[in-house]
Amino acid sequence: IFPLAFFIYVPMNEQIVIGRLDEDIILPSSFERGSEVVIHWKYQDSYKVHSYYKGSDHLESQDPRYANRTSLFYNEIQNGNASLFFRRVSLLDEGIYTCYVGTAIQVITNKVVLKVGVFLTPVMKYEKRNTNSFLICSVLSVYPRPIITWKMDNTPISENNMEETGSLDSFSINSPLNITGSNSSYECTIENSLLKQTWTGRWTMKDGLHKMQSEHVSLSCQPVNDYFSPNQDFKVTWSRMKSGTFSVLAYYLSSSQNTIINESRFSWNKELINQSDFSMNLMDLNLSDSGEYLCNISSDEYTLLTIHTVHVEPSQETASHN
């Protein structure tokens, strides 16, 4: 014997939407199509986000923070789409949104939880402070607080300093590591668990090179296949450290395939570049060319730093003249 009617309790639809700071998102809501559609979107059950009824928007009572930032998919309403298009989300927009939809035959309420993440591309920097050498992994703006891990020669390092400054809506984080006197390779990973986004910085020190004056030097720079994806936009920069600061010798942009060279004695092999080999030559060496040379391959997902130390010694002729 079947009952005349039975009811299954279904909790209010609740969806999680993850947005990225300053980007546009859609808060989804659907309903069984019907006439006399009324749509009210509210934030935290208090603030009016968007109202639509009698065939048009009614935004007189809209909270000012949503002004010019919301719209519906007007051509889709008759098909049961009450989703909200939300422009330029900020961290203050995080929270619970309720969509009330009324028609001639029913009323439904959907809840959407909006979480907002920030992940401005991090950087890995190599710095000299007096006699010390530091690797610094930093991210200018990130939310929520990221997970930062360091590895030395692929082995996790427990020591992990984090300098954190919190602004109104995100964190700025620096994680320095003292690598003075080390020839190991280092890797720093910054992970934003909300956005499921990971960035990796890798630093490799090459063996020192000894060259004579007037000779040329070839410095290798090849990306590690684990990280490198040639389809992704990246930038390659060669720079030389002089008295604690780096000066850029040349750079290459994959998006435009442009090479800009600031040092006339520097040369890049176009064919090698096409094979993702960014090794460079420096001709006609002089004593002032001694120092550290840094190759930086960077994309949104990684930074690969390769450091070469070059010692230029006087040639026999020069020495005998002195």
């Epitope: 009824y53 009698k54 009572s61 009324g102 009323v107």
Partner: antibody
């Protein structure tokens, strides 16, 4: 089925106050906007006020603005009309009516049976 | 405020007749118009909404038409139960009722 039952009517002197109630059943009270509509003896219908499903918006007819206040208690499934500074012309049967949905539309598929308010000295 | 004017005020008709009641708005109300039927001592009953949509459970002999400022309610074949007072209501801006049309037996 939807049921709306008004109460609180009676005879009151001009200038005095009265509070009407409307008890609802048979639907999810907090999903619907509610209105008060009145009808003077032998006369036509006059819309008085509306309150939205969530209590966020209230609107009034010019004839009662500043004197009447509509309110609701979703936990008690009740609608109220607080009537102050009553006048002879407020004499009418007061109906509680349910909006099609949120209160934003403004027409009434469901009505109560009404309660009579007489303002007389 | 939007004024609603109904005509006629009183209408005499017989069972089986086709009758039409007109409602005029003082300004355009698009199609945001409802029609109600009321019998003495009873609450009004919704017949038509959005000018021409028939409310669930209402007999198909009732129909509505019009948009802008001119609207009509038509009863295609009067039944004994249809003798009552009919009101139009605009809900484009808040709400206003017409003064009513009393439909009586001829």
């Amino acid at each position: 089925q939807v049921q709306l039952v008004e109460s609180g009517g009676g005879v009151v002197q001009p200038g005095r106050s009265l509070r009407l109630s409307c008890a609802a059943s048979g639907f999810t009270f907090s999903d619907y906007g509610l209105h008060w509509v009145r009808q003077a003896p032998g006369r036509g219908l006059e819309w008085v006020a509306v309150i939205w499903y969530d209590g966020s918006e209230e609107y009034y007819a010019d004839s009662v603005k500043g004197r009447f206040t509509i309110s609701r208690d979703n936990s008690k499934k009740s609608l109220y009309l607080q009537m102050n500074s009553l006048r002879a012309e407020d004499t009418a049967v007061y109906f509680c009516a349910r909006d099609r949905n949120s209160g934003a539309l403004g027409y009434f598929p469901h009505w109560g049976q009404g309660t009579l308010v007489t303002v007389s000295s | 405020d939007i004024q609603m004017t109904q005509s006629p005020s009183t209408l005499s008709a017989s069972v089986g007749d086709r009758v039409t009641i007109t409602c005029r708005a003082s300004q355009s109300i698009n199609n945001w118009l409802a029609w109600y039927q009321q019998k003495p001592g009873k609450a009004p009953k919704l017949l038509i909404y959005k000018a021409s949509s028939l409310e669930s459970g209402v007999p198909s002999r009732f129909s509505g038409s019009g948009s802008g400022t001119e609207f009509t309610l038509t009863i295609s074949s009067l039944q004994p139960d249809d003798f009552a007072t009919y009101y139009c209501q605009q809900y484009n801006s808040y709400s206003t009722f017409g003064q009513g049309t009393k439909l009586e037996i001829k």
